[in-house]
């Protein structure tokens, strides 16, 4: 679902025909400088080129625009807005070029936009408007259908001083625009936690990606509304356990497929439900791939492999008997 | 990618028939497939489908007669028709459903099945 | 049940002009936009060419367009050329407490005049 290149012709503009007719209006389907064009394919590509800012220029055609690897910087408000607007874009692809910075309004004007990409971008201020548009309580729903962000977490020197989850949280939330998003990839972001109220507010998620992240616990997240939620993507984070609340809201979705690979399970006690559960369900891919990690002397085994007796804590000593 | 059916043809009122849409290409429980039905000179009709994790959802009328069911080892679909009547001779079609719309963005050749005495 | 109602049953038009397809849910389709509308010819299984009320399909000519939300729907061919000529089917898709429901509508036969 991918906007993808047609193998139609694409046509080059080279920058010093722009910079001859940049007195003029732009020609309604001219090709901008350094970018690649197909009318045909409705894709317009202007990739690896140091861009530092969106191309004015860009065909009203264009369906599928790629703006990868460039040093964009800052998107302003309106960056993509134009007379007349572009009405066909459908998918935008603006990862890996350099992006700092969303500004509110970012991605107004666009009527048709279902798919974006800013994944690989060090986002150290995404406005908490940068997708609704606007501050109202409840914006006009945007229509984004796929939200890729993966990889926007910027370095840590260059963070504000808040919580980066709870940046990316305010502009998936602001004004309730969101709600028609049925992807939503946010893998690689160093996340800590989930704020407990981001699942309640996008109905409509299908597919959500959180791998790759450093998720401890899923006790506060509730995935009890995300009804149509058909794939859980937590594989490679910190995760120790899900404790019985969790197990049995996914227990409770009718499609969901989760996926729990390379965390470090710990395979004590409080372990005994979710493993009990896991030799249950069908809600788990590949559930036999999952191991423990801790205590030392459990490493390695295959968790749908232990029973009760194996999943012992080790008793809490009253002070007098404990040892330095 | 492609879909392929299989398994029609001839049988009496009152019979079974089990038909098969085998995939290439993709992985069958990635994704939600559904079955179609057209009569001859006929429109669409929609008989059931098969959601990711197994769930299925049938038309009011194949509740009960039709049952869609998946091997994922085989990466094969299957729609188990019983108590079969002259009426439900036609060409049967596999559909798979797009990951992120709810819209049939693939499709089989389809297979007949006439059920005639 | 849920009936999707398509009008005209059959249409002429002539080359290079525009014909226009309706299409009624007696309910609304699910998120409001997810309707799709095929194109079949004979002897051929049916081919996607629009979803989500708007969105063309991978290699679907631009003269090809939808519209509408809720419970009507419109596909509209804007130029016609003789490789259009076909039955054109609307499938709505709806949810429910109970689970998924898919319904077509009963096709428009599209001819040349």
């Known amino acids: 679902s991918s906007p993808t290149s047609s193998a139609s012709s694409f046509s080059s503009s080279a920058p010093f025909l722009a910079s001859a007719v940049s007195a003029q209006p732009p020609l309604p389907d001219q090709c901008p400088a350094l970018c690649e064009c197909s009318e045909a394919a409705r894709t317009v590509k202007c990739v690896n080129r140091n861009l530092t800012e969106v191309p004015t220029d860009l065909p009203a055609y264009v369906r599928n625009l790629f703006l990868t690897g460039n040093q964009l910087a800052v998107l302003p408000a309106g960056a993509f807005a134009r007379r007349p607007p572009l009405a066909e874009l459908a998918a935008l692809n603006l990862s890996g070029s350099r992006l700092d910075e969303v500004r509110a309004g970012a991605f107004e004007h666009l009527p048709s936009l279902r798919q974006l990409d800013l994944s690989h971008n060090p986002l150290a201020d995404l406005s908490p408007f940068a997708f609704s548009g606007s501050n109202a309580s409840v914006s006009a729903p945007s229509p984004l259908v796929e939200l890729i962000l993966n990889h926007i977490v910027p370095p840590e020197d260059e963070r504000q001083n808040r919580s980066f989850e709870g940046m990316v949280v305010a502009a998936l939330l602001a004004g309730r625009a969101l709600q028609g998003l049925r992807r939503l990839e946010l893998a690689s972001n160093h996340f800590l936690y989930l704020p407990r109220d981001v699942l309640a507010q996008l109905p409509s998620l299908r597919h959500l990606d959180l791998s790759n992240n450093s998720l401890v616990s899923l006790t506060y997240v509730s995935f009890r509304n995300l009804t149509h939620l058909e794939s859980l993507h937590l594989e490679d984070n910190a995760l120790k356990v899900l404790h019985n609340g969790t197990l049995a809201e996914l227990q409770g979705l009718p499609h969901i497929r989760v996926f729990l690979d390379n965390n470090p399970w710990v395979c004590d006690c409080h372990m005994a439900d979710m493993v009990t559960w896991l030799k249950e369900t069908e809600v788990v891919q590949g559930k036999d791939r999952l191991t423990c990690a801790y205590p030392e002397k459990m490493r390695n085994r295959v968790l749908l492999e232990l029973n009760s007796a194996d999943l012992d804590c080790d008793p809490i000593l009253p002070p007098s008997l404990q040892t330095s | 990618q492609s879909v392929e059916e299989s398994g029609g043809g001839l049988v009496q009122p009152g019979g079974s028939l089990r038909l098969s849409c085998a995939a290439s290409g993709f992985s069958l429980s990635s994704y939600w497939m559904s079955w179609v039905r057209q009569a001859c000179g006929k429109g669409l009709e929609w008989i059931g489908i098969?959601?990711?994790?197994?769930?299925?959802y049938y038309a009011s009328w194949a509740k009960g007669r039709f049952t869609i069911s998946r091997d994922n080892s085989k990466n094969t679909l299957y729609l188990q028709m019983n108590s079969l009547r002259a009426e439900d001779t036609a060409v049967y079609y596999c559909?798979?459903?797009?990951?992120?719309?709810?819209?049939?963005?693939?499709w089989g050749q389809g297979t007949l099945v006439t059920v005639s005495s | 049940d849920i009936v999707m109602t398509q009008s005209p049953d059959s249409l002429a038009v002539s080359l290079g002009e525009r014909a226009t397809i309706n299409c009624q849910s007696s309910q609304s389709v699910y998120s409001n936009n997810e309707l799709s509308w095929y194109q079949q010819k004979p002897g051929q299984p049916p081919k996607l060419l629009i979803y989500y009320a708007s969105t063309l399909a991978s290699g679907v000519p631009d003269r090809f367009s939808g519209s509408g939300s809720g419970t009507d729907f419109t596909l509209t061919i804007s130029s016609l050329q003789a490789e259009d000529v076909a039955v054109y089917y609307c499938?709505?898709?709806?949810?429910?407490?109970?689970?998924?429901?898919?319904?077509f509508g009963g096709g428009t036969k599209l001819e040349i005049k």
């Open positions: 499938q709505g898709s709806y949810y429910s407490g109970s689970g998924w429901y898919y319904a």
């Open positions: 098969i959601a990711g994790r197994g769930s299925t």
């Open positions: 559909a798979r459903v797009s990951s992120i719309y709810y819209t049939f963005n693939l």
